[in-house]
């Protein structure tokens, strides 16, 4: 039977090395065996390149195309082929369809003043246009309570977020994930980073007097544990000293 495209290709670029196009066929298709996506930069002397698509689902195909470091003027001509049959033809401008790379290496560290320091890495090298354009969304959720979640927008430059332990339930396990977008490029959101999980422990300090540091913190690495021990010792002494004066 004839091969038809149900939903035409939708493409996004990470604006550094890769563009990804996805489309849906009208019936289950072996994408890599039956289809080819050709792409060519509209630039004098540019060669034609071919992308072999892969299946995402039975009838959904996806093609990842290596591109050079994108610039605003770049426009690609795309042609979707089934053998000698041209199924679809269109153009794609990476700078107008940006989906940032996923932020990486999300970690949670105990910090001074009963805060958790969430850190992640900017997925772009400093010389890339997007490096200084990214803002982030951090989602923090209670692993055992779907109603208990918070969303933080990080609009400043550094890929960090300070989170007061008191804003989270004590003794609960929390997961955080982060995604990025580039406002000036009117981008879509990146995919979410893998989640990182930690155990939150917070009680009002009045209840801590005379109590040992609780065990749940042992889930932290030794460096983090030392940091929080020192921070809590200092704060405990300050707190105690404060009460003596009054």
């Amino acid at each position: 039977g004839s091969v038809k495209v149900l939903h035409e290709p939708s493409c996004f670029s990470d604006y550094i090395s890769t563009s990804v196009c996805q489309w849906k066929m009208d019936h289950p298709t072996n994408c890599s065996a039956e289809l080819r996506l050709s792409y060519q930069l509209d630039f004098m002397g540019s060669e034609n390149h071919t992308c072999v698509p892969e299946n995402r689902e039975d009838s959904v195909c996806v093609c990842s195309m290596p591109i050079d470091d994108a610039v605003e003027a770049d426009v690609y001509q795309l042609d979707l082929w089934a053998g000698q049959q041209l199924l679809w033809s269109g153009s794609f401008q990476p700078s107008k369809h940006v989906k940032p790379r996923t932020p990486g290496n999300l970690t949670v560290h105990p910090n001074i003043s009963h805060t958790w320091l969430l850190m992640w890495t900017n997925p772009y090298p400093t010389e890339n246009h997007l490096h200084s354009e990214l803002t982030y969304m951090v989602n923090v959720s209670n692993d055992n309570d779907p109603e208990d979640f918070k969303v933080y927008n990080v609009t400043y430059m550094g890929p960090t977020l300070r989170l007061a332990a008191s804003t989270l339930k004590s003794g609960a396990s929390y997961s955080a994930r982060v995604r990025a977008w580039a406002q000036t490029y009117n981008s879509t959101w990146s995919d979410w980073s893998p989640s990182t999980t930690w155990l939150n422990y917070y009680e009002p300090w009045e209840q801590h007097l005379g109590k040992p540091i609780p065990n749940p913190l042992l889930g932290l690495d030794s460096t983090g544990l030392n940091d929080i021990f020192e921070a809590q010792k200092i704060e405990w002494h300050e707190h105690h000293h404060h009460h003596h004066h009054h």
């Epitope: 002397g45 060669e47 770049d74």
Partner: antibody, heavy 125, light 112 residues
Framework: EVQLVESGGDLVKPGGSLRLSCVAS????????MTWVRQAPGKGLQWVSL????????YYADAVKGRFTISRDNAKNTLYLQMNSLRAEDTAVYYC??????????????????WGQGTLVTVSS | DIVMTQTPLSLSVSPGETASISCRSS???????????LDWYLQKPGQSPQGLIY???KRASGVPDRFSGSGSGTDFTLRISRVEANDTGVYYC?????????FGQGTKLEIK
């Protein structure tokens, strides 16, 4: 040493044909687009045609479109210009030159960085 | 087609002085930040052309730093400082951005 050597220039009558060759050495020929540029006696430079590294893309000046064909044999490191239906105004020295690097997605450009010595084509009755 | 216009068409300069040649294009040659597709070539008497400057300001291999290119968009300049007798010839600007590639008319530099 990077070098281009043209040949094939001759005296030909109007309406006649000629094939110019340009043999390249000293660089990876297939990775680069190649260009033909001509210069009529006492005149300036005029671009004629360009071909991508694989030979898959060709471009022509309006003055020669439909009459001239650029091609290449990467196995022989040779660029060609087939010239048909020649006219008096095609009289010129024809130069081949190394153009942009086309093995990358966006061609990398370093100018026409090597030129041949030129071959003279004279179209006259 | 992109039209390239050079000024002046001829120039006479004493040795040691600076020569400036202007080139204007009918369309912007700025493809992306820092990438102006404009070249300068020199054709010495009886010789093939040779590349001097590409992408507006980058010197071709082996070209002395007396030669410098500047400008962006549609207006470009070639400067030759401390001119020498060997610099005699015709200077051409060229745009390699769009087909057809187009050259300026040429500027003839004469050393007094």
């Amino acid at each position: 040493e990077v070098q281009l050597v043209e040949s094939g220039g001759d005296l030909v009558k109007p309406g006649g044909s000629l094939r110019l060759s340009c043999v390249a050495s000293g660089f990876t020929f297939r990775d680069y687009a190649m260009t033909w540029v001509r210069q009529a006696p006492g005149k300036g430079l005029q671009w004629v045609s360009l071909i991508s590294g694989s030979g898959g893309k060709t471009y022509y000046a309006d003055a020669v479109k439909g009459r001239f064909t650029i091609s290449r044999d990467n196995a022989k490191n040779t660029l060609y210009l087939q010239m048909n239906s020649l006219r008096a105004e095609d009289t010129a020295v024809y130069y081949c030159a190394v153009d942009r690097l086309t093995k990358t997605i966006r061609p990398q450009y370093y100018g026409l960085w090597v030129w041949g010595q030129g071959t003279l084509v004279t179209v006259s009755s | 087609d992109i039209v390239m216009t050079q000024t002046p068409l001829s120039l006479s300069v004493s040795p040691g002085e600076t020569a400036s040649i202007s080139c204007r294009s009918s369309q912007s040659l700025l493809y992306s930040i820092g990438y102006n597709y404009l070249d300068w070539y020199l054709q010495k008497p009886g010789q093939s052309p040779q590349g001097l400057i590409y992408l507006g300001s980058k010197r071709a291999s082996g070209v002395p730093d007396r030669f410098s290119g500047s400008g962006s968009g549609t207006d470009f300049t070639l400067r030759i400082s401390r001119v020498e007798a060997n610099d005699t010839g015709v200077y051409y600007c060229m745009q390699p951005l769009q087909s057809p590639l187009t050259f300026g008319q040429g500027t003839k530099l004469e050393i007094k």
